[in-house]
């Protein structure tokens, strides 16, 4: 290499990143292997709970403005849960990123945006709840679904919009033991006239604006929303917390437990710039609370179980419904069965308290599913315990 | 090729000040983080200040900060060292150094003698 | 501040031989390791950078290793040039001090 050529620029903390060798010490090894079952379970776990949550809620409930919030959460988490199995390889391969930097950059993004979006589908939760108790005149005449729909849309494309810095300054660095390194780069895209000055600015900026956007707002908009709930609650003479009251408890409680260290270890990532003293702490700890962040995905369908009463015996009654239809249809290819399937479904859905979402008449199994996904899954109205928890508008 | 060419040395007497330069050429000095480095008369190297490749941030050990201004001036190519309150032990011979990265000095100059002495 | 304690302070080989200097750190220096090569009268010369890894257009005799706050520079097979003062140095946390050098003479 000619001594003119300069090397690929990297900030202070990245470089020494890049200089940390792999041990292959037994126990290190053994932690690696748990690891790697560890965030596989959670891969599974996180794509089937969501998968079903979507369904249950999407396809067999009464649409609300409460289960399309609830709908919007498990979206987010199903995408988040889609990126686990890759994060999972890069750690089955020894920590390695083996597939290249275009997907580096996507997998990092789906991470961000699923925090983007779940802190502020949560503040929109509480507003919403906020609005319905202290304006409910309002509320009554404003709160449809296809508001709510209107209004996830906007909050998606302000976590897509927040997820883009996150996206520009991912890359690709080879560590000098012949490992890739899948992280920031805030030097990647016009680094400046100094260096120095530009990776202690654009670290603290991403570390600040993500602690404050996904974190600390959302946090502050959920307390006072139910800081405004409480008092007018309160001045009603009304105690007893509803059904969706607890879940949106639950689900924030595991928000703020979830990603609270994540931005803790991410604000001290920022100072180790300037602070190299904290950077091995940081390098212990962040891959740990970034797993933690991770398994708020999958935490998050186990809440909306947990805390809607029946919710379990609806959804193994659900599920059972879902397979007997697939088997009654793989059963029954030839024309003649026809009048045996509808009569099938509709003993289904009067079995079920939670209804089928599509009619006889209409497509099965997966062009069902892309029908629900293109918006055309037609709901009917049904008072199960879920649902009653999910379009509770009283609490 | 790569050439840094230190100046600026000489005898100076205790309490007096002096400015060492350091003239690059063969490689795009702004891209690229500088350093002082003095070795005393048959002693080891010590590290003096470092200065990031835009001029923004500098640093300095415990002996030399507040005494001891490292600078830049990127449109001529040049490294500079401002010493104030000049000490017996500051005798040494300075050499500037370029750094390979954040770190590691890949390219030395031949260096230029400062001898503080009344 | 971290001291770097290197050892021997001299030693005397011939060509051929196979030369091993260690440095030693106060802390864990994570890597951030150079080692450099002096002879009388010139500037110094970068060998190793990032404790392991050999800097452009040094002979491959020369290699490094070590982690934490151990770190080694081996000379498979000693040649008449290679006879100088060598320096270890951290980067880890300022100020970035240095050994206080290994002179190898010949024997």
């Known amino acids: 290499m000619s001594a003119n050529a300069t090397l690929k620029p990297l900030c202070p903390i990245l470089e020494q990143m890049s200089r940390l060798q792999s041990h292959s010490n037994t126990s290190i090894r053994y932690i690696d292997h748990a690891a790697v079952l560890l965030h596989g379970l959670a891969s599974l776990l996180g794509l089937v709970e969501n998968g079903v949550i979507l369904f249950v809620v999407g396809c067999r409930m009464r649409q609300t403005v409460v289960t399309t919030w609830v709908l919007h959460l498990a979206l987010s988490d199903l995408l988040a849960s889609a990126s686990l199995p890759f994060f999972t390889y890069f750690l089955a391969v020894g920590h390695s990123w083996e597939l290249g930097t275009t997907f580096c950059k996507l997998h990092s993004s789906i991470f961000f945006l699923n925090m983007f979006a779940s802190g502020f589908l949560l503040s929109a939760i509480s507003l919403d709840r906020c609005l319905q108790v202290v304006r409910p005149v309002w509320a009554q005449n404003h709160r449809t679904v296809a508001a709510a729909h209107k209004v996830c849309l906007v909050l998606w494309a302000l976590a897509v919009l927040n997820t883009v810095p996150y996206f520009v300054f991912r890359d690709t660095i080879s560590r000098l033991d012949g490992r890739i390194m899948c992280y920031y780069n805030v030097l990647l895209l016009n680094p400046g006239p100094d260096r120095d000055a530009t990776c202690n600015s654009r670290q603290a900026a991403l570390a600040v604006s993500k602690f404050l956007l996904a974190f600390l707002v959302p946090l502050a908009i959920i307390a006072s929303s139910h800081a405004a709930v409480s008092l007018r609650l309160q001045h009603r003479g009304r105690r007893r917390p509803g059904r969706f009251v607890r879940l949106v408890a639950a689900v924030v409680a595991a928000f703020a437990l979830c990603w609270g260290p994540y931005h803790v270890f991410s604000l001290l990532e920022a100072r180790a710039h300037a602070n190299p003293g904290l950077r091995p702490l940081v390098w212990r700890g962040l891959p740990f609370v970034t797993s933690l962040a991770f398994f708020n995905s999958v935490a998050n369908p186990v809440l909306y179980v947990l805390t809607c009463p029946d919710m379990l015996r609806k959804l193994r009654r659900s599920l059972r419904t879902v397979l007997e239809s697939v088997l009654v249809d793989d059963s029954e290819l030839g024309g003649a069965g026809s009048s045996r399937r509808r009569r099938t479904s509709s003993t289904a859905r009067s079995a079920s308290p939670l209804a089928l979402c599509s009619r006889p008449e209409e497509p099965r199994g997966p062009a069902r599913l892309l029908g629900w996904l293109l918006g055309s899954c037609a709901a009917s109205p049904q008072t199960g315990p879920l649902n009653r928890a999910l379009s509770s508008t009283s609490s | 090729e790569v050439q840094l060419v230190e100046s600026g040395g000489g005898l100076v007497q205790p309490g007096g000040s002096l400015r060492l330069s350091c003239a690059a050429s063969?490689?795009?000095?702004?891209?690229?983080?500088m350093s002082w480095v003095r070795q005393a008369p048959g002693k080891g190297l010590e590290w003096v200040a470092r200065i990031s490749n835009g001029g923004s941030t500098t640093d300095y050990p415990g002996t030399v900060e507040g005494r001891f201004t490292i600078s830049r001036d990127n449109s001529k190519n040049t490294l500079y060292l401002q010493m104030n309150s000049l000490r017996a032990e500051d005798t040494a011979v300075y050499y500037c150094?370029?750094?390979?990265?954040?770190?590691?000095?890949?390219?030395w100059g031949q260096g230029t003698l400062v001898t503080v002495s009344s | 501040d971290i001291q770097m304690t290197q050892s021997p302070s001299s030693l005397s080989a011939s060509v051929g031989d196979r030369v091993t200097i260690t440095c030693r750190a106060s802390e864990n220096i994570y890597y951030n390791l150079a080692w450099y090569q002096q002879k009388p009268g010139k500037a110094p010369k970068l060998v190793v950078y990032a404790a392991t890894q050999l800097a452009d257009g040094v002979p491959s005799r020369f290699s490094g290793s070590g982690s934490g706050t151990d770190y080694t520079l081996t000379i498979s097979s000693l040649q008449p040039e290679d006879f100088a003062t060598y320096y270890c140095?951290?980067?880890?946390?300022?100020?970035?001090?240095f050994g206080q050098g290994t002179k190898v003479e010949i024997k």
């Open positions: 140095q951290h980067f880890w946390i300022t100020p970035w001090t």
């Open positions: 063969g490689f795009t000095f702004s891209s690229y983080l």
């Open positions: 150094a370029r750094h390979r990265t954040n770190w590691d000095f890949d390219y």
